[in-house]
Interface confidence: medium
Amino acid sequence: QLPPGKPEIFKCRSPNKETFTCWWRPGTDGGLPTNYSLTYHREGETLMHECPDYITGGPNSCHFGKQYTSMWRTYVMMVNATNQMGSSFSDELYVDVTYIVQPDPPLELTVEVKQPEDRKPYLWMKWSPPTLIDLKTGWFTLLYEIRLKPEKAAEWETHFAGQQTEFKILSLHPGQKYLVQVRCKPDHGYWSAWSPATFIQIPSDFIMNDEQKLISEEDLGGEQKLISEEDLHHHHHH
């Protein structure tokens, strides 16, 4: 029988900057029942507080509701594991809610094949930001990424849509059924999960155009460029 091993706070996430949850991994239990408590203080304060809600986030978690969540304040937190033989502390973790936002996926993804008489046909997609995100306040800049592939293909084709909530693609394989998904990321946070796949059948008479993958700048209202997922994860706006 031993004191408990060192726990580790391994993840903190917020859906919208208004609440957040942190999770920890217990260390070894030392062969005895072990109690865990999370304590925290805010940057510039010395008063320690205990986790306000150990239930909402599930086992080994601490949930901070609206009244406990401050933007632009760093939270300094640690977990204490205690059994009859002694205690151990996790390393401190520093959490700024601005940096840990992982939104829900975008909503209402609509995909249509557009075949204007005077222009080449294109695939048009439109979506809405996740419900919990209030873009009107200016707290958020959401970036979007789209991926699509023929139903039987292994590889996804990925496009960066910037802050737009619609996108047009010219070059597709006629007669194929495509899966389309979209995800979003706040400027300092994490990518959401991909939205549920939307299926679209590309007509057999859809004209291929390999030279112009994306519709022109004036049609899109801004320059388009392809950015890798890794680049984008580290893409910060200041």
């Epitope: 300094v76 520093y94 959490v95």
Partner: antibody, heavy 120, light 113 residues
């Protein structure tokens, strides 16, 4: 106003011992990690040792491990560095530095430094 | 140990010019738990102790002029001075505080021509 005042430096022979002190004021000393960082003449910065608010949590550079001991007296707002078995390569200005947080994350205030010269 | 490498070792720049100093870490200092890069930038003027300019790779310390900014993530970081002033002549150091031993870059000496 945050102030950190180092003392205890001087000339010592190789193999000798010195004890550096750092008197802190202007902030709640017990709430912050503290560190020692050194700078050899004309050279860059080298982290030496840190101590968290829980005094049992101490960390050392490999170059000083087993020879130097960091400690703190929260009741006197003072940080210490006991340096044993000193070598010529320990010659440097030693800075006391306050961490931004309770652990060792970035040093937001530094003392003026105290010079340690190890020479025969 | 994490090795921090700065470039260039020294640079001479005109007053008012935009200046960048680069810092590369030998392994990532971005923590997935809180999405923070554990990197700081310091300025050291002759005969004085270092002064903290930037922490968490991009957060400006209070009182630091807004011409100083930090950017980058993972292993590659940049300190930018948007318009160089005479008082910015100094040596600049990056430092990682992701893992002990906490390590500094070798320094970049900034001078005015």
């Amino acid at each position: 106003e945050v102030q950190l005042l180092e003392s205890g430096g001087g000339l010592v022979q190789p193999g000798g011992t010195l004890r550096l002190s750092c008197a802190a004021s202007g902030f709640t000393f017990s709430a912050y990690a503290m560190s020692w960082v050194r700078q050899a003449p004309g050279k860059g910065l080298e982290w030496v040792s840190s101590i968290n608010v829980r005094a049992g949590d101490t960390y050392y550079a490999d170059s000083v491990k087993g020879r130097f001991t960091i400690s703190r007296d929260n009741s006197k707002n003072t940080l210490f560095l006991l340096m044993n078995s000193l070598r010529a390569e320990d010659t440097a200005a030693y800075y006391c530095a306050k961490a931004r947080y309770s652990s060792n994350w970035g040093f937001d205030f530094w003392g003026q430094g105290t010079l340690v010269t190890v020479s025969s | 140990d994490i090795v921090m490498t700065q470039s260039p070792d020294s640079l001479t720049v005109s007053l008012g010019a935009r200046t960048t100093i680069n810092c590369q870490s030998s392994q990532t200092i971005l923590h997935s738990s809180n999405n923070h890069n554990y990197l700081a930038w310091y300025q050291q003027k002759p005969g004085l102790p270092p002064k903290l300019l930037i922490y968490w790779s991009s957060t400006r310390e209070s009182g630091v002029p807004d011409r100083f900014s930090g950017s980058g993530s993972g292993t590659d970081f940049t300190l930018t001075i948007s318009s160089l002033q005479a008082e910015d002549v100094a040596i600049y150091y990056c430092q990682q505080y992701s893992n002990t031993p906490y390590t500094f870059g070798q320094g970049t000496k900034l001078e005015i021509n």
